[in-house]
């Protein structure tokens, strides 16, 4: 926890943030909570970003005040106004950009005192992979596709049966730049697969880890997928 120091006779209050990741082109949330105050009009929330002159967002006297908002955040931010009274100062951020990455500060003033906490916001692209039987291949193969990743991830195949196996020799992975010239489509093909075995396609960069599982039997195909954001920690 990071505690703001008391100023002018006021006590310090506890402010808690959660390091998080934003998926570029999507909408994100920068998490921040604080000790609640019973009077909304006494609460001031300021979001600041290191290296940015203007404010990211300001909420005071029960409403937004965007007079000093930096141009890069114009029309892109909102707090959950109805939840401020219960100590939620989290910020909604529209259309996350790569340039939104950095260190943010959630600064709170209430009638109880002042406090702030920093938050590291990482930005990139991540998506859930879809694994299918590759009907184009000459031998029995699996195709793992994920539409949006950045930075370039690593792709590893694994098998439930042969857990220590290295499939790099029997797989081929390609990265295709998407039209917006930032994110990439990930395609990986695994050759010579065995029926009645569960295979996992694992895609990972420094922001997220995603897994697509597939099990092909004589009668059915079972799929499962999972996405996990990395390094989410409280401050």
């Amino acid at each position: 926890f990071i505690i703001g120091f008391g100023i002018s006779g006021r006590h310090s209050i506890t402010v808690t943030t959660l390091t998080s990741a934003g998926n570029i082109g999507e909408d994100g949330i920068l998490s921040c909570t604080f000790e609640p105050d019973i009077k909304l009009s006494d609460i001031v929330i300021q979001w600041l970003k290191e290296g940015v002159t203007g404010l990211v967002h300001e909420f005071k006297k029960g409403k937004d005040d965007l007079s000093d908002q930096d141009e890069m955040f114009r029309g892109r931010t909102a707090v959950f106004a109805d939840q401020v009274i219960v100590g939620n100062a989290s910020l909604r951020l529209k259309n996350v950009q790569l340039t939104d990455a950095g260190t943010y500060k959630c600064y709170i003033i209430t009638s109880k005192g002042k406090g702030n906490a920093k938050l590291e916001y990482k930005t990139g692209a991540f998506s859930i992979p879809e694994v299918n039987v590759d009907s184009n291949a000459s031998s029995e193969s699996l195709r793992c596709e994920a539409p949006r990743w950045f930075p370039q991830p690593t792709v590893v195949w694994a098998s439930q049966v042969d857990q220590g196996a290295n499939f790099s020799e029997v797989s081929n992975t390609s990265f295709e730049l998407n039209p917006e010239n930032v994110t990439m489509k990930v395609v990986s093909v695994l050759y010579n697969v065995t029926i009645n075995t569960t295979y996992s396609c694992m895609i990972e960069n420094d922001i997220a880890k995603a897994t697509g599982d597939i099990r092909v039997t004589d009668s059915e195909i079972k799929r499962q997928s999972h996405l996990q954001l990395l390094n989410s920690k409280a401050s």
């Epitope: 999507e26 114009r74 029309g75 931010t77 909102a78 529209k94 917006e180």
Partner: antibody
Framework: QLQLQESGPGLVKPSETLSLTCTVS??????????WGWIRQPPGKGLEWIGN???????YYNPSLRSRVTISVDTSKNQFSLKLSSVTAADTAVYYC????????????WGQGTLVTVSS | EIVMTQSPATLSVSPGERATLSCRAS??????LAWYQQKPGQAPRLLIY???TRATGIPARFSGSGSGTEFTLTISSLQSEDFAVYYC?????????FGGGTKVEIK
């Protein structure tokens, strides 16, 4: 209930400057969670966003019109204004003013609109 | 800029029937989309924002769905006052842009 009302000349000569004012009633233009925007609609066509302004005076314009557009605000009169310079017949349209959410950025409510014809 | 494409251009529906209007974005706009209704000689009226949230005072027969690039406005049972032109608008990135509109007319 918040209401917006556009006013200004209905006829402007080519190459001159179109000037419109939007008067806000039933609420303050200083309301912090909103921008104040202009949208236009040529006869029988679709809608085009022109730009917006915050009560503090900061503006954002549609790049296609940026070189010709100025939006200003007068908080003492609860008004904001649009100026569009060097007009041509292509600028003939119904011009609407509207309140624009700071985020989400939907337009609500709208003024009833005023037709501006560019003709000599 | 993001191009918004609406289809069909005209939709002929009988009163009481369901109307389904489509809006497609040239790139993902997440859920940052609004729908408006415009009647002849009137200003547009906000129906839906956030792709699926009904604006204040809008009847429950209007519903919005979709995210990313594909969106739908559904009018479950058309009333006489619903015959109008409907526009979608993205506010995901500047400049905000509108679709070309769908005219819902009486069949």
């Amino acid at each position: 209930q918040l209401q917006l009302q556009e006013s200004g000349p209905g006829l402007v000569k080519p190459s001159e400057t179109l000037s419109l004012t939007c008067t806000v009633s039933g609420g303050s233009i200083k309301s912090g969670s909103y921008y104040w925007g202009w949208i236009r609609q040529p006869p029988g066509k679709g809608l085009e966003w022109i730009g917006n302004i915050y009560y503090s005076g900061s503006t954002y314009y549609n790049p296609s019109l940026r070189s010709r557009v100025t939006i200003s605000v007068d908080t003492s009169k609860n008004q904001f204004s649009l100026k569009l310079s060097s007009v041509t017949a292509a600028d003939t349209a119904v011009y609407y003013c509207a309140r624009e959410g700071s985020y989400p950025n939907q337009f609500d409510p709208w003024g009833q609109g005023t037709l501006v014809t560019v003709s000599s | 800029e993001i191009v918004m494409t609406q289809s069909p251009a005209t939709l002929s529906v009988s009163p009481g029937e369901r109307a389904t209007l489509s809006c497609r974005a040239s790139q993902s706009v997440s859920s940052n989309l609004a729908w408006y209704q415009q009647k002849p000689g009137q200003a547009p009226r906000l129906l839906i924002y956030g792709a699926s949230t009904r604006a204040t005072g809008i009847p429950a027969r209007f519903s919005g769905s979709g995210s990313g690039t594909e969106f739908t406005l559904t009018i479950s049972s058309l009333q006489s006052e619903d015959f109008a032109v409907y526009y979608c608008q993205q506010y995901h990135s500047f400049p905000f842009t509108f679709g070309g509109g769908t005219k819902v007319e009486i069949k």
